[in-house]
């Protein structure tokens, strides 16, 4: 069952999945100047059994200017409904992720892959949040959200993260500070542009988390 909505956006934070549940779809998209080949797949699909999962279909692009040359790329179909867009991720993933049954790893990038990926998540998917560079985290609980099915409708749970003040970057345990992305410029002068690569799986929150001065509610 596909999740109806994107994971909730939190101010000055980004989210990422460490692994993708079977049934997850990744749109085949190309960077500017490339397009999906006519017979090419629209998306990659995480499939498998209890012992092994992998991405079915391969995204292929051709140069918009060239008819015959094809390249393996994540293509960019005409812009669809904005959905589950994450910044381009590093193929380097934690080892534990590969052993998660019923999950696929982050697909490695291809030449000329678009800088954003659009995922269609399924029920049970978990995503993790971290503050962008220049903001620090105040936690009341796990900085994660899970897509759950309740009364026939899907909903992402509330991530307990507040990114406040232009201060130290919040990171997951053992993670190096993210580097500013060379890709493009921020959309405003106040943007903090940072990639969300190389997240570490966070199985539990650090015992020394700051007490949040914030309270959260559902509206």
């Amino acid at each position: 069952e596909l999740c109806d909505d994107d994971p909730p956006e939190i101010p000055h934070a980004t989210f990422k999945a460490m692994a993708y549940k079977e049934g997850t779809m990744l749109n085949c998209e190309c960077k500017r100047g490339f397009r999906r080949i006519k017979s090419g797949s629209l998306y990659m699909l995480c499939t498998g059994n209890s012992s092994h999962s992998s991405w079915d279909n391969q995204c292929q692009c051709t140069s918009s200017a060239t008819r015959n040359t094809t390249k393996q790329v994540t293509p960019q179909p005409e812009e669809q409904k904005e959905r589950k867009t994450t910044e381009m991720q590093s193929p380097m993933q934690p080892v534990d992720q590969a052993s998660l049954p019923g999950h696929c790893r982050e697909p490695p990038p291809w030449e000329n892959e678009a800088t954003e990926r659009i995922y269609h998540f399924v029920v049970g998917q978990m995503v993790y949040y971290q503050c962008v560079q220049g903001y620090r985290a105040l936690h009341r609980g796990p900085a994660e959200s899970v897509c759950k099915m309740t009364h026939g409708k899907t909903r992402w749970t509330q991530p307990q993260l507040i990114c406040t003040g232009e201060m130290e970057t919040s990171q997951f345990p053992g993670e190096e500070k993210p580097q500013a992305s060379p890709e493009g410029r921020p959309e405003s002068e106040t943007s903090c542009l940072v990639t969300t690569t190389d997240f570490q799986i966070q199985t539990e929150m650090a015992a020394t988390m700051e007490t949040s001065i914030f309270t959260t509610e559902y509206q």
């Epitope: 909730p8 956006e9 954003e116 959309e187 959260t216 509610e217 509206q219």
Partner: nanobody, 118 residues
Framework: DVQLVESGGGLVQPGGSLRLSCAAS????????MSWYRQAPGKERELVAY????????TYTDSVKGRFTISRDNAKNTVYLQMNSLKPDDTAVYYC???????????WGQGTQVTVSS
């Protein structure tokens, strides 16, 4: 062009109420988390409240909890901050912020002055 235009600020007596509005244009409003920040003279800008994208989770700083309410109307591309039981400490310039993680979007309004004084 992206625009965030705040309105509704003004001078109010302690215990009074104001409703701030932030009208957004130039981006897909429903795909952005919306928040209100404030900055008092000589102090750092602080997060007051935010509301996520669907399903619209809200978060408040403790100093305004129970007094302020943030809400959004995706059909009108507008976010609101209802401020009740105002105190002199609430005096500040209030800024509206729109945020999306990827593709990156981080937009700020010009601010609206709120003064609580007798």
């Amino acid at each position: 062009d992206v625009q965030l235009v705040e309105s509704g600020g003004g001078l109010v007596q302690p215990g009074g109420s104001l409703r701030l509005s932030c009208a957004a244009s130039g981006f897909t409003f429903s795909s952005y988390a919306m928040s209100w920040y404030r900055q008092a003279p000589g102090k750092e800008r602080e997060l007051v409240a935010y509301i996520t994208t669907s399903p619209g989770y809200t978060t408040y700083t403790d100093s305004v909890k129970g007094r302020f309410t943030i809400s959004r109307d995706n059909a009108k591309n507008t976010v609101y901050l209802q401020m009740n039981s105002l105190k002199p400490d609430d005096t500040a310039v209030y800024y509206c912020n729109a945020w999306r993680g990827a593709p990156r979007g981080d937009y700020w309004g010009q601010g609206t002055q709120v003064t609580v004084s007798s």
